[in-house]
């Protein structure tokens, strides 16, 4: 239980002339106190005490979570993908009601042939993963399906996937123009109605390392930026060394503040250092002591 402590107040005047009130405890009263959350006040910037140390929130670190990290982990996905919703009309198979049932033998056979056909059509596209039929309907067989594309994440992934979707469009247009019925017969694996080919929608994975970096940097978002090394994005402040944006503090230490990166200059036995980049050295004057 927390004890109630009688307190009297003593007033002092600071050198600036303002009045400071300081509590003074009446020690005549025996006190039992339970230190509740005392360590929590040690942990700044939203950090919390785990019983041993402060657990800091990004982008803070240090004994009391008072310092700002120089770099923040951002993890782009290993692979990124695109999904194209397409419709083609197959004329070499006649529609039957069983095709609507995805567990029927008819659907399984159609799915097998259609998948084989599309694997042939898209065989030259390295990003191609496969096709997935979403719906079959009358006319002969109108095939609503997804074409799935995937590639390794690089800064240019959107361009790679955009290019792949263009090649998909070209290839499906070509095959549905060339593989058509002659006298109600199809000599190809599948035949199509040229006019039934449509691209309904294209969805591409959205990943923006700059956005992730800014979000994780929170109130320091204006001072953290993304730089690439070996195609991998790094979320760094100017205090992180080894990047184009790195701040050179010469004879000093880089420290982040809410106004950005600044250099804290050092003083050596022989010099004082100053200036924005701690590059201005002033030699200390030597005083000779005579006895």
């Amino acid at each position: 239980p927390l004890a109630t402590i009688p307190v009297s107040t003593t007033s002092l005047t600071s050198s600036e002339g303002s009045t400071i009130s300081t509590p003074s405890v009446d020690i005549s009263t025996p006190v039992t106190t339970s230190i509740v959350g005392d360590q929590c006040s040690r942990c700044k910037n939203g950090g919390f005490w785990d019983g041993l140390k402060c657990q800091c929130l990004t982008p803070y670190y240090g004994e009391s979570c008072e310092e700002v990290v120089n770099s923040i982990d951002i993890a782009p996905p290993e692979t990124v993908s695109a999904q194209m919703e397409l419709t083609v009309t197959v004329t070499s198979v006649k529609f039957t009601d069983e095709l609507k049932n995805h567990s029927s033998q008819e659907f399984r056979e159609f799915n097998k042939t259609f998948t084989e056909q599309m694997n042939i059509v898209y065989s030259g596209i390295p990003e191609y993963v496969g096709v997935n039929i979403t719906n079959l309907r009358l006319g002969s067989v109108v095939v609503e399906h997804d074409v799935l594309l995937r590639t390794k994440y690089t800064p240019e992934y959107k361009t790679a996937l955009d290019n792949a979707t263009e090649v998909v469009k070209q290839k499906i247009t070509k095959v549905t123009t060339e593989q058509i019925m002659t006298n109600d017969n199809c000599s190809a694996l599948m035949c199509f109605n040229t006019t039934g080919t449509q691209v309904q929608n294209i969805t591409v994975t959205q990943y923006d390392p700059v956005e992730e970096c800014r979000q994780k940097a929170e109130e320091y978002e204006d001072y953290f930026l993304v730089e690439y090394r070996d195609q991998k994005p790094y979320c760094i402040s100017p205090c992180e060394s080894g990047f184009n944006a790195s701040k050179n503090c010469n004879h000093g230490k880089c420290q982040m503040s809410q106004n950005g990166a600044r250099c804290l200059c050092v003083t050596t036995e022989t010099h004082w250092y100053s200036g924005e980049d701690c590059n201005q050295g002033t030699q200390k004057s030597h005083h000779h002591h005579h006895h």
């Epitope: 070499s92 056979e109 159609f110 017969n185 000599s187 694996l189």
Partner: nanobody, 123 residues
């Protein structure tokens, strides 16, 4: 699952006749597509005669007027009546089926196959 068993092949003189049979097991005989394909030595498998449950039939130009495809639903059997046989009809004949109502001559679109029966036309 459809299983097919072809029979009726043999050696016949030019101008002779043969009747091939293909017995099907499974409950799918009344629907889908059925057909006969053949493969001569060193050549690709080709469609000879095909039939679908909606009435579509196909005959290769080289057999038109000589071969007839038919089926007996009560016996779950497919037939190929071959008349006026020629030396160029020599091949292994395969029966094929699909539960789909097909219009394709491409063997890769047909999912179920019987083992072949050899037809040799020689004097």
């Amino acid at each position: 699952e459809v299983q097919l068993q072809a029979s009726g092949g043999g050696v016949v003189q030019p101008g002779g006749s043969l009747r091939l049979s293909c017995a099907a097991s499974g409950d799918t005989f009344s629907r889908g597509s059925w057909g006969w394909f053949r493969q001569a030595p060193g050549k690709e498998r080709e469609a000879v005669a095909l039939i679908s449950s909606d009435g579509w039939t196909f005959y290769a130009d080289s057999v038109k007027g000589r071969f007839t495809i038919s089926q007996d639903n009560s016996k779950n059997t497919l037939y190929l009546q071959m008349n006026s046989l020629r030396a160029e009809d020599t091949a292994v004949y395969y029966c094929a089926a699909s539960v789909l109502v097909l219009r394709t001559l491409n063997p890769k679109a047909w999912h179920h196959w019987g083992q072949g029966t050899m037809v040799t036309v020689s004097s």
